[in-house]
């Protein structure tokens, strides 16, 4: 674009150099050249000469009009055709931008990843604005009434050291650009309720050589949270359908989960946990792939009908990926109940 240009005249834009996309725009060029009475005044957009909707207002001034200007950025300049000059003479130039006022930020979420020392807040920004947009995160203590503000671009990490005076906060986000401002809904946050346990990791898996082979998956976390509720999902690599098992976990020792799986098949396992009774889940752990042993007996084991686990498994359900391109986006299909209660209602969040 044109950042600094020595003008021999002026160029101005109505309604302004930054305007709402789709508006009608008039750009004026006024020459103040010495020793020149211009025959013509020309407009260029992004280096290309414009041919239409140009009006000569008087000897020194011309206007170009755009109906429904919809380019996010353009650089405009105008020139004069001076008698006796072979080349056109530059008058002035301007960068112009069009965009949208921001949408109200939505889906504001704040979490504290265990051991991180930060409260991380994220939100959906809505449709693109095409112009520079700032986000101001407001954090107001419900106990002391003190308010802090943080400037952000798409998320913010706030040190928990600056949240010492209180446990309960009101958080909201303001989206601001030169075309407008919108506020998100306010989020009530209790610091003790938004902690996500330290990452859970599947460390290894083994399949026994028993008559009815079983697969034992070992998994762990460094969390200090005592009551943790976890889900493990698993499927064959060729399948779209996940099975999900739920566990109450105590990470003072390595967790062991037993599965009766199809022999000679490659399975993918993932685990995620949350503090029991809270709403924020860890992301799913990295996929852990395990190959079950070849079949020794004749029985073809069905993972949905086998006598399940001796560990305190609560529920098994089946979910399926909506498309092979989005394996993390899941949809509840059916639930097989092993401990007398249905699968948690959170499966639409999987991924």
């Amino acid at each position: 674009g044109i950042t600094s240009i020595n003008c021999s005249g002026d160029m101005w834009v109505e309604p302004g150099e930054i305007f709402q996309m789709g508006m009608n725009v008039s750009i004026y060029c006024q020459e103040a050249l010495k020793h020149c009475r211009p025959r013509n005044l020309y407009f260029y957009k992004n280096g290309f000469k414009e041919e239409f909707d140009i009006t000569r207002i008087n000897r020194t001034t011309a206007r170009i009009w755009y109906k429904g200007f919809s380019e996010p950025h353009a650089y405009m300049h105008c020139t004069a055709e001076c008698p006796g000059h072979f080349q056109e003479t530059l008058i002035c130039g301007k960068d112009i931008s069009s965009g949208h006022p921001p949408d109200a930020p939505s889906n504001l979420t704040c979490v504290i990843y265990e051991y991180s020392g930060n409260m991380t807040c994220t939100w959906n920004t809505g449709k693109p604005t095409y112009i520079d947009t700032k986000y101001i995160v407001h954090v107001k203590s419900l106990e002391t009434e003190e308010e802090q503000q943080y400037l952000a671009s798409s998320y913010v990490k706030i040190s928990t050291d600056s949240l010492q005076g209180s446990r309960k906060y009101l958080v909201w986000v303001q989206a601001v650009n030169s075309l407008g401002m919108e506020n998100s809904q306010q989020l009530h946050v209790h610091l003790d309720d938004i902690v996500i346990p330290s990452a859970s990791i599947i460390s290894r898996a083994e399949t026994t050589n028993d008559t009815v082979p079983k697969t034992i998956v070992y998994w762990k976390s460094k969390t200090m949270i005592e009551k943790v509720f976890c889900e493990m999902r698993y499927k064959t690599t060729t399948n779209q359908t996940w099975s999900v098992k739920e566990f109450d976990a105590n990470f003072t020792y390595v967790q062991q989960s037993e599965f009766y799986l199809e022999p000679d098949s490659k399975y993918v396992f993932q685990v995620r946990c949350q503090e029991t009774g809270k709403r924020n889940w860890q992301p799913w752990s990295s996929p852990f792939v395990h190959q079950t042993s070849q079949e020794t007996g004749k029985r073809n084991w069905q993972p949905w009908s086998s006598p399940f686990v001796h560990q305190t498994s609560q529920t098994v359900s089946q979910v399926t990926a909506k498309s092979s391109h989005e394996p993390q986006k899941m949809e509840m299909l059916s639930a097989t109940i092993f401990r007398g209660h249905p699968a948690s209602g959170n499966h639409q969040d999987i991924g």
Epitope: I131, D132, K134, L151, S178
Partner: nanobody
Framework: QVQLQESGGGSVQAGGSLRLSCAAS????????MGWYRQAPGKERELVSM???????FYADSVKGRFTFSQENAKNTVYLQMNSLKPEDTAMYYC??????????WGQGTQVTVSS
């Protein structure tokens, strides 16, 4: 850490003008996104105007066309020219320096009182 000092407040009749100044000191000033904010008694602090980027400024609807934000980089100073003042503009005015991911730093504020 940046320090901010506002000046230029005072009492004025409705329809009058004031020019607020905010002088910044401290090495982080150049990375600041500068803004003017105000807080009327019993109300939340609200954003009045903010320099979004070069050539782009936000103005709250209530002040559009009456207030003008400007800056003088050589002096590390920003200004808020307030024309056609109204009684509802009465508030404590603060300038703020916001840097990405950091807590916004405020000045001490300057009082503006508009009487009818």
């Amino acid at each position: 850490q940046v320090q901010l000092q506002e000046s230029g407040g005072g009492s004025v009749q409705a329809g009058g003008s004031l020019r607020l100044s905010c002088a910044a000191s401290g090495y982080t000033y150049s990375s600041c996104t500068m803004g003017w904010y105000r807080q009327a008694p019993g109300k939340e602090r609200e954003l009045v105007s903010m320099l979004i980027s070069d050539g782009s400024t936000f103005y709250a609807d209530s002040v559009k066309g009456r207030f003008t934000f400007s800056q003088e980089n050589a002096k590390n100073t920003v200004y808020l020219q307030m024309n056609s003042l109204k009684p509802e503009d009465t508030a404590m005015y603060y300038c703020g320096c916001a840097t990405l991911g950091s807590r916004t730093v405020w000045g001490q504020g300057t009082q503006v009182t508009v009487s009818s």
